[in-house]
């Protein structure tokens, strides 16, 4: 627009106006007249680029006329009043309403004054994110899925994670004409380390004040990963009882623990208590390989530990889990 003081009447309007599919929107358009300038407006006209004729006209003496009277309305222009506000309301926005519109004032004696406004027809998408529960495959698979449904224009989906991963994004037409559903898969080689970790799907769209963040808690199903703790290689005759623990990570949770030895069943000094194995005091040296076998829905895995109880004064040594 020309700077103030140029002595010219100018039309003020935003260059772009957003409106939502199915809703109504107002295309604002005003005539700005410098203080000392005299002007008389005889007609307001709205036209769409590329179409012949006017879609809406407000004449100083005849009032309004519309190409689609049920969908258009001058919001402020009134017969018998100064025509300074040409703002036009459009009802029931359709995809095909998107485009460039010209708002024109016929002023006397200054002549035509017009401005172009781009109407953007938007549809606010609905966003969801869900985990894709996977097993250990050894190759990249979708582990999370983020869907932005019925957006116009299509939403932008990005993933944020410390785990790496690759996005795979696709688009299909939405339920409503002119809208788009965007689906983004987050792809990674599954591992037990990833299970329970979070990834974030970030959805950006013109209709959002700020991006929407959707967190997905990853699920990887894997058989138990087993280790035995509680032994420090310093067990001696005469010590109090000690405890070994069978540490198992798995998804789903372990369904059973089974203790044994390489020779078969447990010796009398070893008592199984679920994930724990109680080692009672012994009076002679031993050298036994213990086995903990853990089962879950995906299978069984085991860990082995060779335990030695050696001769030597117990006061000089520390043993783990002595009571």
């Amino acid at each position: 627009w020309p700077p103030p003081g140029t002595g010219d009447v100018v039309v003020q309007a935003p260059t772009q106006v957003p409106g939502f599919l199915g809703d109504s929107v107002t295309l604002p358009c005003y005539l700005q007249v410098p203080n000392m300038e005299v002007t008389h407006v005889s007609q307001l006209t709205w036209a769409r680029h590329g179409e012949s004729g006017s879609m809406a006209v407000f004449h100083q003496t005849q009032g309004p006329s519309y190409s689609e009277s049920k969908r258009l309305e001058f919001v402020a222009a009134r017969l018998g009043a100064e025509l300074r506000n040409a703002s036009l309301r459009m009802f029931g926005l359709r995809v095909e309403d998107e485009g460039n519109y010209t708002c024109l004032f016929v002023t006397f004696p200054q002549g035509s004054r017009s401005v172009d406004i781009w109407l953007r027809v938007l549809a606010k998408p609905q966003n969801t994110a869900e985990v894709q529960k996977v097993q250990l495959t050894g190759e990249p698979v979708p582990m999370a899925r983020c869907v932005s449904t019925g957006g116009r224009p299509p939403a932008q989906i990005t993933w944020h994670s410390d785990l790496g991963g690759m996005p795979n994004t696709s688009q299909v037409p939405g339920f409503l004409s002119g809208t788009v559903t965007v689906t983004s898969l987050w792809i990674l080689v599954p591992s037990s380390q990833v299970d329970g970790k979070n990834v974030t799907c970030k959805v950006e769209h013109e209709s959002f004040e700020k991006p929407q963040l959707l967190t997905v808690n990853l699920t990887v199903y894997y058989p138990p990963e087993v280790s035995i703790s509680g032994y420090d290689n310093n067990w001696y005759l005469g010590q109090n009882e000690a405890t070994l623990t069978c540490d198992a990570r798995s998804n789903p949770e372990p369904t059973g623990y089974n203790w044994s030895t390489t020779m078969g069943p447990l010796p009398p000094f070893a008592v199984a208590q679920g994930a724990q194995l109680l080692i009672r005091p012994v009076d002679k040296p031993i050298n036994t390989t213990l086995i903990c076998n853990v089962t879950n829905a995906l299978g069984a895995r085991q860990a082995e530990l060779t335990v030695q109880v050696k001769e030597g004064p117990p006061s000089e040594h520390s043993g783990i889990s002595r009571n």
Partner: antibody, heavy 121, light 109 residues
């Protein structure tokens, strides 16, 4: 075709009033702007005022404010200019002019034949 | 009070080109002054030629063109014809009124 036909010559005494008419034909009168312009003997043109025929909205040259009134009668497609408190320097030929519109701007399109007003005691 | 000044008289040969100018006492003429040009031939009614600085009125020959020339409004006649001999007036808009120039008597000789 578009035509503006003005009333005949007038002779008036100082202090009197004169009302000049301008009958339009050949176009939609109510959508038009009409200016009144005068030309004193041996002088250039002087713009007096304009009127929008459809509503009667006016804009006067401040020099004439209070002495001049412009009106229209849409039933007869006639514009009127009344000038009061006449002085000898109001002696001039008075013209009505319809403004035409080209799609971008206005211009002084069609003029009446002029009405001579003589102010003399 | 704005004063609009035109050349009192100009002469052009038939087929020649002549430029009539319109100067404003308030400074440079701009598009906001909506320069109008009006022609009056002897014994005939006035006729509008140009509006809005450079918009030729319907029916006006293309040899007439309006423009801004430096700080003045200008009417250029290219390829003058004998019938173009007339008085030419410019009018400038000053926010709330039109002011006419004194006119230019153009002779085609």
């Amino acid at each position: 075709q578009v035509q503006l036909v003005q009333s005949g010559a007038e002779v008036k005494k100082p202090g009197a009033s004169v009302k000049v008419s301008c009958k339009a034909s050949g176009y939609t009168f109510t959508s038009s702007y009409i200016s009144w312009v005068r030309q004193a003997p041996g002088q250039g043109l002087e713009w007096i005022a304009w009127i929008y025929a459809g509503t009667g909205d006016t804009n006067y040259n401040q020099k004439f404010t209070g002495r001049v009134t412009m009106t229209t009668d849409t039933s007869t497609s006639t514009a009127y200019m009344e000038l009061r408190s006449l002085r000898s320097d109001d002696t001039a030929v008075y013209y009505c002019a319809r403004h035409g519109y080209t799609g971008r701007g206005w211009y002084f399109a069609v003029w009446g034949q002029g009405t001579t007003v003589t102010v003399s005691s | 009070q704005a004063v609009v000044t035109q050349e009192p008289s100009l002469t052009v040969s038939p087929g020649g080109t002549v430029t009539l100018t319109c100067r404003s006492s308030t400074g440079a003429v701009t598009t906001s002054n909506l320069a109008n040009w009006v022609q009056q031939k002897p014994g005939q009614a006035f006729r509008g030629l140009i509006g809005h600085t450079n918009n030729r009125a319907p029916g006006v020959p293309a040899r007439f063109s309006g423009s801004l020339l430096g700080d003045k409004a200008a009417l250029t006649l290219s390829g003058a014809q004998p019938e173009d001999e007339a008085e030419y007036y410019c009018a400038l808009w000053y926010s709330n009124k039109f002011v006419f120039g004194g006119g230019t008597k153009l002779t085609v000789l």
